[in-house]
């Protein structure tokens, strides 16, 4: 039951996560105009991943695409490629944790199947995270050295009377939601792992059948493993696996295709 | 059709307040900024402040700060402004103007003079 | 606060002339995000309100005759009236739409000669 719901729970959280990584790499401010000490401008300006926008007070907005590609900065280029592998990964990860959700019967897939496929989901999950984190991190970061570069030569004077004033860009809610939602995927990642281990069999290296003596229970391995004996609750615990058969134990505690978890 | 209409000239003492309005009609009041401007005898246009009738926020030209109060009846879509500790130097012609693309203003009201004499 | 300078401050000009009223401003009114000129220009009248001619420093307003233009960039801007008309004997001003506080320039007053 709570390895059921950690993954349901990583599902969910990862599902919320890449979501954010999606809104995130669309929305536009990723840097916004340093408003200083004024909170009210005439013109304010903010950028995204893909185009820049100029928003008048007069409520006038208007969009530029970047249409070229060689002639932007590599390190956009790197952080739109982080998104975008962000993207992708998670993407493939929420399809493959979709079939590994042990509450979803598909045919007759094995537990362990289920296992390698929670755990394939978790690590794209957390790949995932981290390719948003580094992403956004990368874009704060040439902010911050942007913005103390034009804080440096913020006003160039020009034959002494004439000032241009730089325009300065500060963190936009796109990097906050970048931040949070990569945190989510990542946390999701780490559910699913967790997860994983719980679905996983102990011993998977063999298959067995449980064999029953007319006098005591022994539960016979073939292939010169030892033996356990069914006494107490140890073949309780110990999941023996061969296709459809089961142990007797198991035919009464695990749920039948049919049932919903 | 667009128009902006302003309430009539007034005189007034110095230290005396006055309060200008300006009728908006033709268009949808709350989408757009309405800003004040005055112009004395002479002198060179001077903005004054400006107000959203949608989420009526404000702001003014520090030169006016604490003298002028911009406020709005949405209901009338009506706008006005509001002078006060008058001194002769504020004897002018005031404006109120819509906001368009580009930051410009493209509708004026008619004007209204205040005579701020003893 | 930008200030802005219009030369001259007064022109006399011949019908059917051009006329050239310029705008210096104290800042650049060039906003790098869109590479617009918050530049305005208005035209008035005695008696008048003013009455919006350009935007964006050379975008006309829909009305305003083609004989109306405008240019520049930066700190330097210019009205030009192609072919001067009766109708256009005016104060002519620049504002900058660029900045709080809007600021205007001190006018320029059209005439026939």
């Known amino acids: 039951m709570a390895v059921t719901a950690c993954q349901g729970l990583g599902f969910v959280v990862s599902l919320i996560g890449i979501a954010g990584i999606i809104a995130a790499t669309c929305m536009d401010q990723w840097s916004t105009q340093d408003l200083y000490n004024n909170p009210v401008t005439a013109v304010f300006n903010y950028q995204g991943l893909w185009r820049s926008c100029v928003r008048e007070s007069s409520g006038f907005t208007e969009c530029r695409g970047y249409f070229t590609l060689l002639g932007l900065p590599a390190m956009l280029q790197a952080v739109r490629a982080l998104m975008i592998v962000g993207i992708v990964l998670g993407a493939i990860g929420l399809l493959v944790s979709i079939f590994a959700l042990k509450c979803i019967r598909i045919g007759s897939m094995e537990d362990s199947a289920k296992a390698n496929m929670t755990l394939t989901s978790g690590i794209m999950f957390i790949v995932s995270g981290l390719c948003a984190i580094a992403g956004v991190s990368v874009f704060a970061n040439m902010l911050v050295t942007n913005f103390w570069m034009s804080t440096a030569n913020m006003y160039t004077g020009m034959g002494g009377m004439v000032q241009t004033v730089q325009t300065r860009y500060t963190f936009g809610a796109a990097l906050f939601v970048g931040w949070v939602a990569g945190g989510l995927t990542l946390i999701g990642g780490v559910m699913m792992c967790i997860a994983c281990r719980g679905l996983a069999p102990e011993e998977t290296n063999y298959k067995a059948v449980s064999y029953h003596a007319s006098g005591h229970s022994v539960a016979y391995k073939p292939g010169g493993f030892k033996a356990s004996t069914g006494f107490g609750s140890n073949t309780k615990n110990k999941k023996i696996y061969d296709g459809g058969a089961r142990t007797e134990d198991e035919v009464q505690s695990y749920p039948s295709k049919h049932d919903y978890v | 059709e667009v128009q902006l209409v302003q309430s009539g000239a007034e005189v007034k003492k110095p230290g005396a307040s006055v309060k200008v309005s300006c009728k908006a009609s033709?268009?949808?009041?709350?989408?757009?900024?309405m800003h004040w401007v005055r112009q004395a005898p002479g002198q060179r246009l001077e903005w004054m402040g400006m107000?959203?009738?949608?989420?009526?926020?404000?702001n003014y030209n520090e030169k006016f700060k604490g003298r002028v109060t911009l406020t709005l009846d949405k209901s009338a879509s009506t706008a006005y402004m509001e002078l006060s500790s008058l001194r002769s130097e504020d004897t002018a012609v005031y404006y109120c103007?819509?906001?368009?693309?580009?930051?410009?203003?493209?509708?004026w009201g008619q004007g209204t003079t205040v005579t701020v004499s003893s | 606060d930008i200030v802005l300078t219009q030369s001259p401050d007064s022109l006399a000009v011949s019908l059917g002339e051009r006329a050239t009223i310029n705008c210096k401003s104290s800042q650049s009114l060039l906003n790098s995000g869109n590479q617009k000129n918050y530049l305005t220009w208005y035209q008035q009248k005695p008696g008048q309100p003013p009455k919006l001619l350009i935007y964006w420093a050379s975008t006309r307003e829909s009305g305003v005759p083609d004989r109306f233009s405008g240019s520049g960039s930066g700190t330097d801007f210019t009205l030009t009236i192609s072919s001067l008309q009766a109708e256009d004997v005016a104060v002519y001003y620049c504002?900058?739409?660029?900045?709080?506080?809007?600021?205007f320039g001190q006018g320029t007053k059209l005439e026939i000669k």
């Open positions: 033709g268009y949808t009041f709350t989408s757009y900024w």
């Open positions: 103007a819509r906001l368009k693309t580009g930051n410009s203003f493209d509708y």
């Open positions: 504002q900058n739409a660029y900045t709080y506080p809007f600021t």
């Open positions: 107000i959203h009738p949608n989420s009526g926020s404000t």
